[in-house]
Amino acid sequence: KNLKSPQKVEVDIIDDNFILRWNRSDESVGNVTFSFDYQKTGMDNWIKLSGCQNITSTKCNFSSLKLNVYEEIKLRIRAEKENTSSWYEVDSFTPFRKAQIGPPEVHLEAEDKAIVIHISPGTKDSVMWALDGLSFTYSLVIWKNSSGVEERIENIYSRHKIYKLSPETTYCLKVKAALLTSWKIGVYSPVHCIKTTVENELPPPENIEVSVQNQNYVLKWDYTYANMTFQVQWLHAFLKRNPGNHLYKWKQIPDCENVKTTQCVFPQNVFQKGIYLLRVQASDGNNTSFWSEEIKFDTEIQAFLLPPVFNIRSLSDSFHIYIGAPKQSGNTPVIQDYPLIYEIIFWENTSNAERKIIEKKTDVTVPNLKPLTVYCVKARAHTMDEKLNKSSVFSDAVCEKTKPGNTSK
């Protein structure tokens, strides 16, 4: 009896694992084995596929074959007993295109009201993703074990901290990877659960803010108790993107080590241009808090988000305000290469009733003013980037008198 060729061959590639599955064509024939050949693009000859010769089951693994994952490959299969079936050819494919991202490896760290998630690719030193290692982003689903209400967090990197959790509560999560450059979404990791600890005696510092004064940065935060000492650390923000189980080398800000106030001042030249993460910790000598939430700090935006400079042209019923670039020390204008929104506050000099205008344009009309009346104006700039969400301080108020009633044109 002629052996029939196997049918419905499926190629599954997850990370560096290459798995073939197929259907037997004739279940009634026993002791049949199966063998595969492969052929690379531009080659005429077929080569035996190691790991997939004389297989008795309907599944084989050819991960040991060192393939160029960007090169097209063709496979064929046949059944063998005393004789052999004809070859069945599988549609050619490119391993990289076909590959799925496997489940990432996840480690969890618990605090009282936070969980740190360390994520690394499931396959160490993967050949498939060798050129894309730095491009992985992750997303996760987290829920309280008791409620099951899920929250999704997108676009995170290899270290992510989730805050504002409840103490002594079990949280569960699963993580998947994505390579947005290749439109690939990975497989979820197994579910990992961890219980947050009992509430710590000392809470972490809160509401950390950075501002610029003269040539210094001023870092301020809030704290519940008095007579504490604080320390501040920084980390390059890009390091969070590093793949694998990275060592995060948080560094001390020397002027912010063991400070006894809820602020510290340090020179701008402590930081080169870049984006940093900052965190603060409190101690009373016996106990130490967990670290505060990490805030993102962009030196360019911090240093250069100075209050806008503006000129007022006074008419009888309005002001025309022309907003210019703020001046650095030395009177040179600051080039701002990110979009800003301007908030303009104005009020009658004799009143406290303030009115507000929000404008993207740099020439703004303040309408509905009374003639021959003194109005004061102040302005500040906001970045339009939601993530950075920074504001300058207000400019000094400038007061001008409107013209008499017939000069509106």
Partner: antibody
Framework: EVQLQQSGAELVKPGASVKLSCTSS????????MHWVKQRTEQGLEWIGR????????KYAPKFQGKATITADTSSNTAYLQLNSLTSEDTAVYYC????????????WGQGTSVTVSS | DIVMTQSQKFMSTSVGDRVSVTCKAS??????VAWYQQKPGQSPKAVIY???YRHRGVPARFTGSGSGTDFTLTISNVQSEDLAEYFC?????????FGGGTKLEIK
């Protein structure tokens, strides 16, 4: 393969100083923190301090401030522990160890260097 | 400094038994706790990190648990090669501190 090779045993006189070395292979010490730990005979482990070889930043346990100085030479992939004003209390085995990931405290240890302080 | 207390200096067990070594921190250290095994005449070897994760190559009979201030290293189905001293360590806050150690003796 990660390995930490420590210098040989030392017999030193009270009041003198000694400098121990820990040479690493299989990884770059710049990417790690290098720690030193003391263990006296039949006693527990005491953390002395650590260095970030990338920039030389150090942290010490208060007890060893002034007693120990940790340095590193990235060109030879070596960390050092110098102990000053030695007394019999400093007689111990000293281990170097590396921290290679934020997940771990330390993941690899050297074989230890025995220091004996005796006149 | 955070004090790590291993209340039992010695523990006696038999091959095949299950034994639990405990460690208490003087303040909340989250899950930043490691366990080390030190056999006689050898340097310490990492067994557990982040309170509950096994280092590569460590047999599955070793499990770590706990968070906050109370931590446990459990060895199920104790083998003769587990004869050693076990140390806990917190790495949440500098200076890092070790427990005093628990010597496991095989009957």
């Amino acid at each position: 393969e990660v390995q930490l090779q420590q210098s040989g045993a030392e017999l030193v006189k009270p009041g003198a100083s000694v400098k121990l070395s820990c040479t690493s292979s299989g990884f770059n010490i710049k990417d790690s923190y290098m720690h030193w730990v003391k263990q006296r005979t039949e006693q527990g482990l005491e953390w002395i301090g650590r260095i970030d070889p990338e920039d030389g930043e150090t942290k010490y346990a208060p007890k060893f401030q002034g007693k120990a100085t940790i340095t590193a030479d990235t060109s030879s992939n070596t960390a050092y522990l110098q102990l000053n004003s030695l007394t019999s209390e400093d007689t111990a085995v000293y281990y170097c160890a590396r921290r290679g990931s934020s997940l771990y405290a330390v993941d690899y240890w050297g074989q230890g260097t025995s220091v004996t302080v005796s006149s | 400094d955070i004090v790590m207390t291993q209340s039992q200096k010695f523990m006696s067990t038999s091959v095949g038994d299950r034994v639990s070594v405990t460690c208490k921190a003087s303040q909340n250290v989250g899950t930043s706790v490691a366990w080390y095994q030190q056999k006689p005449g050898q340097s310490p070897k990492a067994v557990i990190y982040l309170a509950s994760y096994r280092h590569r190559g460590v047999p599955a009979r070793f499990t770590g648990s706990g968070s906050g201030t109370d931590f446990t290293l459990t060895i199920s189905n104790v083998q003769s090669e587990d004869l050693a001293e076990y140390f806990c360590q917190q790495f949440n806050i500098y200076p890092w501190t070790f427990g005093g150690g628990t010597k496991l003796e095989i009957k």
